[in-house]
């Protein structure tokens, strides 16, 4: 029987470092090895018939035990499939190796209205583009961490909001007078230093009533 395997199905490595993605195989008399890269809608061939393809040949080397990168960038994050087949035969096996290139978060950008109407919906956003793996977001009001569920903490029990740590979106619905304050957010991805945005003050104002 044939086997294709990697003892490291997930590899995490800081950006600009060398890395090896392992692929061990047995039971093939004339193995033909291919490596495919997948990330979202992108699919690229890294290695074809035991040879690194032109787009990778300057920075990737084929070894009998895997492929080795001289230096990885954030764009290399994705799933690599090692596919081994018998030359001119039916035997086939494959193994997937997930590569996560670690990049610390950058300073998040916030979109916070300077004023918003009480009783209406107010949307605050926080995002940063560099972090790999993607950052999770924590919101602060007047320097105090906002819990995911406002009812869980006395300080926020009068607020009505939904906080999404993955997207960084904070939605007040409805906004109340007590939501006035200085808001900032923090991005962290478990690698490098968590980064904090600028603080922006939001005023919850009464609805203008026409005479």
């Amino acid at each position: 029987s044939v086997t294709v395997h990697s003892s490291e199905p997930e590899v995490r490595i800081p950006e600009n470092n060398p890395v090896k993605l392992s692929c061990a195989y047995s039971g093939f008399s004339s193995p033909r090895v291919e490596w495919k890269f997948d990330q979202g809608d992108t699919t690229r061939l890294v290695c074809y018939n035991n040879k690194i393809t032109a787009s990778y040949e300057d920075r990737v080397t084929f070894l009998p035990t895997g492929i080795t990168f001289k230096s990885v960038t954030r764009e290399d994050t994705g799933t690599y499939t090692c596919m081994v087949s018998e030359e001119g035969g039916n035997s086939y096996g494959e193994v997937k190796v997930k590569l996560i290139v670690l990049v610390p978060p950058s300073k998040p950008t916030v979109n916070i209205p300077s004023s918003a109407t009480i009783g209406n919906r107010a949307v605050l956003t926080c995002s940063e583009q560099d972090g790999s793996p993607p950052s999770e977001y924590t919101w602060f009001k007047d320097g105090i961490v906002m819990p995911t569920n406002p009812k869980s903490t006395r300080a926020f029990s009068n607020s009505s909001y939904v906080l999404n740590p993955t997207t960084g979106e904070l939605v007040f619905d409805p906004l109340s007078a007590s939501d006035t304050g200085e808001y900032s957010c923090e991005a962290r991805n478990g690698y490098g230093t968590p980064m904090t945005s600028n603080a922006v003050r939001m005023e919850a104002v009464e609805r203008n009533v026409g005479v």
Epitope: P9, V19, K20, L63, T68
Partner: antibody, heavy 116, light 106 residues
Framework: EIQLQQSGPELVKPGASVKVSCKAS????????MYWVKQSHGKSLEWIGY????????RYNQKFKGKATLTVDKSSSTAFMHLNSLTSEDSAVYYC?????????WGQGTTLTVSS | DIQMTQSPSSLSASLGGKVTITCKAS??????IAWYQHKPGKGPRLLIH???TLQAGIPSRFSGSGSGRDYSFSISNLEPEDIGTYYC????????FGGGTKLEIK
């Protein structure tokens, strides 16, 4: 014949550092990752980390990060493990091992004794 | 991390007899288990990989079996040179050794 020949026993004082070597022969040194394994007295084996001799890439078991540093000299087909800030907890036999998927060839071991 | 529980920790058997050692993984390891013989002053010697595949040059007195989380290793027709400590290794996801079994010949 594939062989991994390790350096001899070491007796060092607490706080010092040591460098253990592992010379490979009988195969293409850069084709296989080189692993280091620790065996404390009366205990089982645990992997410390590995180095890919082709490009110098390393991975460490979380437990040994900051304790061990792995390097290679391709010209002499030799792998090295540097252990720093030694304490009695580091007294053990250290092995180098070649990895395919499992560890197929091992060095004879280097005994490290940390004592004042 | 995957844990490997090896038993027994020691055993004694007669020349010509048979012994069996077991390793239980904390999760399914998909047959990716190897067995080693270890003697003092030497490095471990690979006997079996992928549950039951004998390494080149290893006599057929050594055998392995199992699946899922449960694996066993046997030596039949015991010989004096079989004394030593035996370890299992899971290599399905990273690498974890069992605690070892010390074999003595009566």
């Amino acid at each position: 014949e594939i062989q991994l020949q390790q350096s001899g026993p070491e007796l060092v004082k607490p706080g010092a550092s040591v460098k253990v070597s592992c010379k490979a022969s009988g195969y293409s040194f850069t084709d296989y990752s080189m692993y280091w394994v620790k065996q404390s007295h009366g205990k089982s084996l645990e992997w410390i980390g590995y180095i890919d001799p082709y490009n110098g890439g390393t991975r460490y078991n979380q437990k040994f990060k900051g304790k061990a540093t792995l390097t290679v000299d391709k010209s002499s087909s030799t792998a090295f493990m540097h252990l720093n800030s030694l304490t009695s907890e580091d007294s053990a036999v250290y092995y180098c091992a070649r990895q395919t998927d499992y560890f197929d060839y091992w060095g004879q071991g280097t005994t490290l004794t940390v004592s004042s | 991390d995957i844990q490997m529980t090896q038993s027994p920790s020691s055993l004694s058997a007669s020349l010509g007899g048979k012994v069996t050692i077991t390793c239980k993984a904390s999760q399914d390891i998909n047959n990716y288990i190897a067995w080693y013989q270890h003697k003092p002053g030497k490095g471990p010697r690979l006997l079996i990989h992928y549950t039951s595949t004998l390494q080149a040059g290893i006599p057929s007195r050594f055998s392995g079996s199992g699946s899922g989380r449960d694996y066993s290793f046997s030596i039949s027709n015991l010989e004096p040179e079989d004394i030593g400590t035996y370890y299992c290794l899971q290599y399905d996801n990273l690498w974890t050794f069992g605690g070892g079994t010390k074999l003595e010949i009566k």
